[in-house]
Interface confidence: low
């Protein structure tokens, strides 16, 4: 900033603020003999003056909006007025001050928006201009909604992009706008310069009238369809309608069913195409889609719900061919023998599946019929008349009718009369001593065999023994399996042993029968046994808190941003060191101590998301054991890829001479993520000079048509530059070139004399 205040004649540039009365001289040029005086020419506008001695100054305020740069020339003259040096260019750049207010292009704007339009999607733009320099705050405009009328519950339904003036719906507006309640709104919009940040900014306002139009693209009410319909199919069940005619409708089956029994016609009527079976599938959810003529979705898909109504088309079924129960000889009247649970595939908790139970036959009828009764709705069998005697009748067979409101089914029950349970299980020893095991002993290992005996009738519920651990194993690390033939108990490891939490466990077993003991007999100390389990320490690897850690960040996060963290603990309490494995793209680093993961390079969703690396946790000291887990980094898209042509368009041609203006269609794409609606590109010619010969018109979000404006083209190749804007945040623009050849044609193909065969176009238009 410290420069020479005077010097020889040479090209120089100075910057001066506009609008301020002169307060400083600009420069003092020094003459080298034979030069004695100086002369100023160029865009002086009678403002810039050079004194004969070389003092350059200005005599009144500058105006950047009149001229932003003054290109001057200074020459040195000798005593005869002949130029002996120069002229050299002197550039005066006029720096902007905020001396112009922004102005809306219209004092009133009108627009319409459809209810339930996507929030944030612009439906109208307001536009203001400011003569000040747009590269400075003076010309940077900031749009704001001053008021929305009417304002319901203090909720804004509309929003404006502060920079672009794009008006769109808020989330609330998308959900709540309803033309039946309020068909029109008025917004007062302000624009300020200085980026809206200064008290000294200038402003302007405009009025926006907005009409809300009805959106008839709505999900219909859920449909109920009775199963096994005998009516002729297809049957119309509901309908959807796009807001304008001409939409192409289709259904999407998200569940990928082997049989999808629905269709839609081009009116938007939805049909069921065949009878449904509730027992196969009781509800369907699928989507109706509306597309334009180019197959692009017009809006979000609608969810269609179909519930299948039950009819009673299934009889009750028995749980097994024969259900076996046991009853002790001395059981009292009313005691429960067991419960018969039949099933019905019809809809639960309805009359179609509500079951009744009735005993229709008892064999033998000894000493009498009607020894048993069954609870009508619960299916529980009880002893009805007297205690049974095994020596008279060791077995009874019952036939039970199970019925719903339309169907009856017969089920068979066998009741075995068994000896009374008057003997308790007795352990062969009460203390099985100490057992020492390493904490890494395999799950499923048998670590101890225990044995109790029972003197009741063999192979009945009175003598069968079940072993339970009643003390010393609250974590459920151990279990006991019983051999049904020998009543031997095998103590097995069900969950990993752990020295750190349970080094010594005092285990107590209880031996029980599945059948109840007779009145007056109780389990005593003979039915209990104990043993002591001692667990020894094994150095174990660290344990991650999760098998897979997942994090989600935007692909444009700054280098050094924390993107996630992992945690592991060492069972022995040693410190842990974290490291990464498989970071093939070199995007990440991990804090060895905390497990925090940071970005160390630019991330790129288009290179692949999620990005998967392994995280390693290693003991510090000890045996340096380590464990591995996964870290998945989901990269959220930002708009960082400009549009481009979707394919190679070399070889486009028109037959010369053109008999009428022609056109061709091209497609654009980009590599960013597009939600259901796909890209929304806008197209324009890449330079103004092309506009006399060509025009470009948008067909839909991805396709455009390039048309000739006349027929007077030369027989040669033209390269047409197209500007494609993706309308993203921030908007990105690509300039692509379409080479179009005008050539003589033979039978619709380009004709080239021999020796001119290179680069022959192959597509005629």
């Amino acid at each position: 900033q410290e420069g020479k205040f005077s010097g020889p004649l040479k090209p120089m540039t100075f910057s001066i603020y506009e609008g301020q009365e002169p307060s400083q001289i600009i420069f003092q040029f020094k003459a080298n003999p034979p030069a004695v005086t100086f002369e100023l020419t160029g865009e002086t506008d009678n403002i810039f003056v050079i004194e004969r001695e070389g003092l350059l100054y200005y005599n009144r305020a500058l105006d950047r909006e009149t001229r932003s740069t003054h290109n001057l020339q200074v020459a040195a003259l000798d005593a005869n007025g002949i130029i002996v040096e120069g002229p050299v260019p002197i550039t005066i750049k006029v720096k902007d001050i905020n001396d112009n207010r922004p102005t809306f292009l219209q004092s009133k704007y009108e627009g319409s928006v459809r209810q339930n339009s996507r929030p944030g999607k612009p439906f109208l733009y307001v536009n203001a201009t400011d003569l000040d320099d747009p590269a400075t705050p003076n010309g940077q405009l900031y749009y704001q909604i001053v008021i929305q009328l009417p304002m319901i519950n203090n909720v804004m339904y509309f929003q404006i992009n502060n920079k672009t003036g794009a008006i769109s719906l808020t989330r609330e507006g998308s959900q709540e706008l309803n033309p039946a309640k309020n068909p029109s709104y008025n917004l007062v919009i302000s624009v300020k310069d200085m980026g809206g940040q200064s008290e000294n900014s200038f402003s302007d306002t405009t009025s926006v009238d907005i009409i809300v139009t009805e959106n008839i693209w709505k999900a219909p009410k859920p449909v109920e369809m009775v199963e096994n319909s005998t009516d002729p199919h297809p049957i119309k069940i509901t309908q959807v309608r796009w807001n304008d005619p001409g939409a192409q409708y289709s259904l999407v089956d998200k569940e990928k069913l082997p049989r999808f029994p629905f269709s839609i016609d081009q009116e938007g009527d939805i049909y069921v195409t065949q009878p449904l079976d509730r027992e196969e599938k009781d509800a369907y959810v699928f989507y109706a889609v509306a597309k334009d003529e180019y197959g692009k979705p017009l809006s979000y898909p609608l969810e269609i719900h179909v519930k299948v109504k039950d009819i009673n088309d299934n009889p009750p079924t028995c749980p097994s061919p024969v259900t076996v129960f046991e009853v002790q000889e001395n059981e009292r009247l009313g005691n429960s023998i067991g419960t018969l649970t039949a099933h019905d595939r019809d809809e639960e908790n309805t009359a179609n599946s509500f079951l009744n139970y009735r005993i229709v036959e008892q064999t033998p009828k000894l000493p009498m019929d009607g020894l048993f009764l069954i609870q009508t709705y619960a299916g529980m069998l009880q002893l009805a008349k007297q205690s049974l005697k095994k020596q008279d009748t060791p077995q009874y067979n019952l036939t039970i009718e199970v019925s719903d409101k339309d169907f009856k089914t017969l089920c068979f029950v066998q009741i075995n009369v068994i000896d009374i349970n008057d003997q308790i299980p007795i352990f062969e020893k009460s203390d099985y001593g100490n057992l020492t095991l390493a904490e890494d002993t395999n799950i499923g290992s048998t670590i101890l065999t225990i044995q109790a005996t029972d003197a009741d009738e063999p192979f009945t519920g009175s003598s069968k023994i079940l072993y339970h651990i009643i003390k010393g194993d609250s974590e459920g690390r151990l279990g006991v399996d019983t051999d049904p033939h020998t009543n031997t108990g095998y103590v097995i490891i069900k969950k990993p042993l752990d020295f750190e939490t349970a080094a010594v466990s005092n285990i107590v077993f209880k031996a029980e029968n599945p059948e109840p003991l007779v009145f007056g007999v109780k389990y005593n100390a003979s039915s209990f046994a104990k043993f002591t389990l001692i667990v020894t320490d094994v150095n174990e690897a660290p344990q991650f808190s999760q098998h897979v850690f997942q994090a989600k960040v935007s692909e444009d996060v700054a280098i050094g941003t924390k993107v996630g963290n992992v945690t592991a603990k060492d069972p022995e309490g040693l410190d842990i060191s974290y490291s990464l494995r498989g970071d093939t793209r070199g995007w990440l680093k991990i804090d060895h101590v905390t497990g925090e993961i940071f970005s160390v390079a630019p991330l790129d969703r288009e290179a692949g998301s999620p990005y998967r690396v392994q995280v390693v946790a290693t003991e510090v000291g000890g045996s340096s054991l380590s464990s591995v887990s996964e870290f998945h980094l989901i990269l959220m898209d930002v708009n960082d890829n400009p549009p481009r042509l979707a394919k190679d368009y070399t070889g486009l041609f028109f037959c010369h001479p053109l008999s009428a203006p022609g056109s061709l269609i091209f497609e654009a794409t980009d590599d960013d993520q597009h939600l259901f609606r796909g890209p929304h590109f806008t197209f324009s010619l890449g330079s103004g000079s092309l506009q006399n010969d060509w025009e470009v018109s948008k067909i839909n979000g991805t396709h455009a048509r390039l048309s000739t404006r006349h027929t007077e083209f030369e027989e040669r190749e033209y390269v047409v530059l197209i500007r494609i804007n993706d309308g993203g945040r921030p908007p990105l623009e690509g300039i692509v070139s379409l080479p179009v050849t005008f050539c003589s044609c033979v039978e619709g193909s380009c004709f080239r004399p021999a020796g001119h065969q290179t680069g022959i176009p192959t597509v005629g238009m």
Partner: nanobody, 118 residues
Amino acid sequence: QVQLQESGGGLVQPGGSTRLSCVSSRTFSYYDMGWFRQAPGKEREFVALLSWRGNNAEYSDFVMGRFTVSRGNTQNSVNLQMNNLKPEDTGIYYCAVTYGVARSVRLWGQGTQVTVSS
């Protein structure tokens, strides 16, 4: 010999204010008066200046809105009112006579220390 004499400055609390003054031993036409500063370990940088007619003040971005440059009692004096001071404002403040739009320095003062610290 022409001299510039600065005064003011010293130790100031963050958020506080101080005023620097500078007097020249002679009056210059076409020459502007202003202030530069040098923080420890950094190059000398422009702070503010007042045009020789006193009708135009210029400021660097980092002091805009906090510092005000004004004419003293005479044509050959200039003041710098420093408000809302920050620790990064610490340094030696030099009065200077400059020439033209390029702010070419013709004459330096000997400097005065300003320390912003709690």
